[in-house]
């Protein structure tokens, strides 16, 4: 802190502003009958240079000029950007206790003079706006500078505005407080910017608008649609505007989608009709607006209006597939599956379905509502039956879907040949197989159908399956494949009163099992031994088991097991060996192979033959 | 929010002449155009003169046709004062003068356009008797 200067003065020469690589004189300059005593050469004055509060240097080699004990002049050079204190001090060479007393200070500042301010562009934002413009300042001056828009419009009229940049603060746009109205469309206005600190000063060459070129409507407001006569297809979609309005631009898209519906409507008055919507289907509507067919720019867009199209009757053909059960000599379950309709095709809420089983001779009829997806009933054994499912939302149901009730897999000759299940990757299966030999009818369609391998899944779980048309001959099934899981695959061929279908079974993945299968027990029937198991828990199979493997060896032998090699079927849980030596006693023991590989060995049974082997 | 206030008129014989005075107060600024209006019974109200004084010193300055040579327009920024010296008075000069201040929307009449300015002053009437 400087104490209001009572000892003396510091001045500058040429001036405490200076441009960047000028030098300064500092003079130093003490009161009269202010010093360090009645000897004036005993007064000695020093100059320090403080940059952010920090000493950085004592200029005492710097002095050009030294009246003794009265006054001293430094000279500094390569002063930096910015502002730098000095500060003179007092020494008093008599007394060295004492530290320097200050006698006065002075801020150096040192900048460049203003550029020229380039790039202005004004905007008045919707027709009651004001005039706002801005501009490059160029670079950094390091002073206060002062800057001046100025506009100029017809009728010599005139307006300016003022700001300055500083080191706390930016100075590169201005609001006029002026509004341009409408009927001045076809005047040019002109702006400049002037900038002025201590160094000097500058122009901006002069900027020429029209209205047109800077005044930006407001984006419309109030936006709503009304759909006529509860359309799901028609609406029409209103708003308010600014008066001056001629060109609108309308976006409208559904949430989920990545592409905007683009629309201009020209003298559109708050006003407009889509025809092309998709019913029950929730969209996003914008609108911008423009002062002129071909000048001018667009608004921003508006806020977004969000909102559901009505229901319309839903459109599309249900796939339907079915499951035949006989419960006794008379009596079959029939169960009826059906796919959702897609939200395109069901165009609403579906609340129900409507299903039908019509016995085709008798004239029987069987009809219920259900909001489920599937539907089983009881039905005789007897007779020529058909299914019908229809889907129905607030504005009605969609055409009935037909199917004729068949034995799925009654004709051989209908059976599809060569079927093969191989993984493509993580979560699909490639089927292929090749068409019946020698079937009396045409097929009509091929229905690929899947199911996991897991206890229960017949009950639990519905089926999952495609509609193949009769000329292709393979699918790639994906719908709920995981890794590591078995599916039973069967593909159908259909003609118009039979059926007739190969199974086979394929996986996604695989590894090797986890564990091998659980004997449960060993019994000896005519000579021959029967090995028991259990088979391996699901989640443990790791995919479709290909065959098991029985191994069997003396006890205490050091010598390679023997084994025998069953293909795998899920309902066969034991096997017969018999080449065991009676009165021997055997270790034996079971693993299961995937096409990844062998699982370890399961439990181990120790058994010995009584009978005559073979 | 500014407030104007006009004073000086009266009555005078045709070749008179009328000094009229604003007096503006609340958030004065030399910064704006000011401006004098008359309106004569049963006809629109026109612009009559204007003043323009800028941060850069100087100012601009607007007569109607019908008034030049013949009027003047000036302020002292220190009194916040707009003066209208009105010379060779006739009869047509006879109205209601109002003082106003803050050209915030421009039309195409310019500084001439009443709906342009922010601020008015309740009037002073001025009377020319031949």
């Known amino acids: 802190n400087i104490d209001v200067c009572k000892l003396g003065t510091v001045t500058v020469q040429p001036a405490p502003v200076i441009p960047l690589g000028s030098a300064a004189n500092i003079s130093c300059s003490l009161n009269p009958k202010q010093g360090c005593s009645h000897y004036p050469s005993s007064n000695e004055l020093i100059l320090l240079k403080f940059v952010n509060d920090v000493l950085v240097e004592n200029l005492h080699g710097k002095k050009v000029h030294d009246h003794t004990g009265h006054s001293s002049t430094f000279q500094v050079t390569n002063l930096s950007l910015g502002m730098t204190l000095f500060v003179c001090k007092l020494n008093c060479s008599n007394s060295q206790k004492k530290p320097p007393v200050p006698v006065c200070g002075v801020e150096i500042s040192v900048g460049v003079a203003p550029e020229p301010p380039q790039n202005i562009s004004c905007v008045q934002e919707g027709e009651n706006g004001t005039v706002a413009c801005s501009w490059n300042s160029g670079k950094v001056t390091y002073l206060k500078t002062n800057y001046t828009l100025q506009l100029s419009g017809p009728n010599n009229l005139t307006c300016q505005k003022q700001c300055f940049s500083d080191n706390r603060q930016n100075c590169n746009r201005l609001d006029l407080g002026i509004n341009l109205s409408p009927d001045l469309a076809e005047s040019r206005f002109i702006v400049r910017v002037t900038a002025i600190n201590d160094l000097g000063n500058s122009s901006s060459l002069p900027h020429t608008f029209t209205f047109l070129d800077i005044v930006i409507p407001l984006p419309p407001w109030d936006i709503r649609i009304n759909f006529l006569n509860a359309s799901g297809s028609r609406g029409t979609l209103q708003w308010e505007d600014e008066g001056q309005v001629v060109l609108n631009q309308l976006r409208y898209q559904p949430l989920n989608s990545t592409s905007w519906n683009m629309v201009n409507a020209t003298n559109a008055k708050g006003k407009y009709d889509l025809r092309d919507l998709r019913p029950f289907t929730e969209y996003e509507f914008q609108i911008s607006s423009k002062l002129h067919l071909s000048g001018g720019s667009w608004s921003n867009w508006s806020e977004s209006l969000r909102t559901r199209t009505p229901e319309e009757e839903p459109v599309g053909i249900l796939d339907i597939w079915y499951m035949k059960q006989d419960i006794d000599y008379d009596r079959q379950q029939i169960s009826l599956f059906w796919k959702s309709l897609n939200p395109s095709e069901a165009r609403g809420k579906i609340l129900h379905y409507q299903v039908t089983l019509q016995e085709v001779t008798k004239k029987t009829t069987l009809q219920n509502t259900t909001r489920h997806t599937s539907w089983t009933r009881v039905i005789p054994r007897t007779g020529a039956w058909t299914a019908s499912v229809s889907a129905a939302n607030s504005k009605g149901a969609s055409a009935p879907t037909h199917i004729n009730i068949v034995d799925l897999c009654g004709t051989g000759l209908l059976a599809p040949h060569q079927v093969s299940a191989k993984s493509e990757n993580m979560d699909n299966i490639l089927v292929t197989w090749q068409p019946p030999k020698k079937a009396d009818s045409a097929v009509r369609e091929y229905i690929v159908e899947w199911r996991a391998l897991q206890p229960g899944s017949i009950t639990k779980f519905p089926p999952h399956w495609l509609r193949i048309p009769p000329d292709n001959m393979s699918a790639l099934i994906s719908e709920n494949i995981k890794p590591y899981i078995c599916y039973e695959i069967r593909v159908h061929a259909l003609s118009e009163s039979q059926g007739g279908c190969s199974s086979i079974r394929g996986d996604s993945k695989h590894k090797a099992p986890v564990s091998g299968p659980h004997i449960t027990a060993i019994t000896e029937k005519k000579e021959r031994l029967f090995i028991s198991w259990t088979h391996i828990p699901f989640p443990e199979q790791r995919g479709c088991i290909l065959h098991y493997r029985i191994y069997w060896k003396e006890r205490d032998s050091t010598a390679q097991p023997e084994l025998c090699e069953i293909q795998y079927r899920r309902s066969q849980n034991s096997h017969p060996i018999s080449s065991l030596q009676p009165r021997v006693t055997y270790v034996l023991w079971m693993t299961a192979v995937t096409a990844a590989g062998e699982s370890p060995q399961g439990n181990e049974r120790e058994f010995c033959p009584q009978g005559k082997a073979n | 929010q500014v407030q104007l206030q006009e004073s000086g008129g009266g009555s005078v014989q045709a070749g008179g002449s009328l000094r009229l005075s604003c007096a503006a107060s609340g958030a004065t600024n030399s910064n704006r155009h000011m401006g004098w209006f008359r309106q004569a019974p049963g006809k629109e109200r026109e612009g009559v003169a204007a003043i323009y004084t800028g941060y850069t010193g100087g100012g601009n300055t607007y007569y109607a046709d019908s008034v030049k040579d013949r009027f003047t327009i000036s302020q002292d920024n220190a009194k916040n004062t707009l003066y209208l010296q009105m010379n060779s008075l006739t009869p047509e000069d006879t109205a209601m003068y109002y003082c106003?201040?803050?050209?915030?929307?421009?039309?195409?009449?310019?500084?001439?356009?009443?709906?342009?300015?922010?601020?008015w002053g309740q009037g002073t009437q001025v009377t020319v008797s031949s």
């Open positions: 106003a201040a803050d050209l915030t929307r421009w039309y195409s009449g310019g500084w001439r356009d009443p709906r342009g300015y922010k601020y």
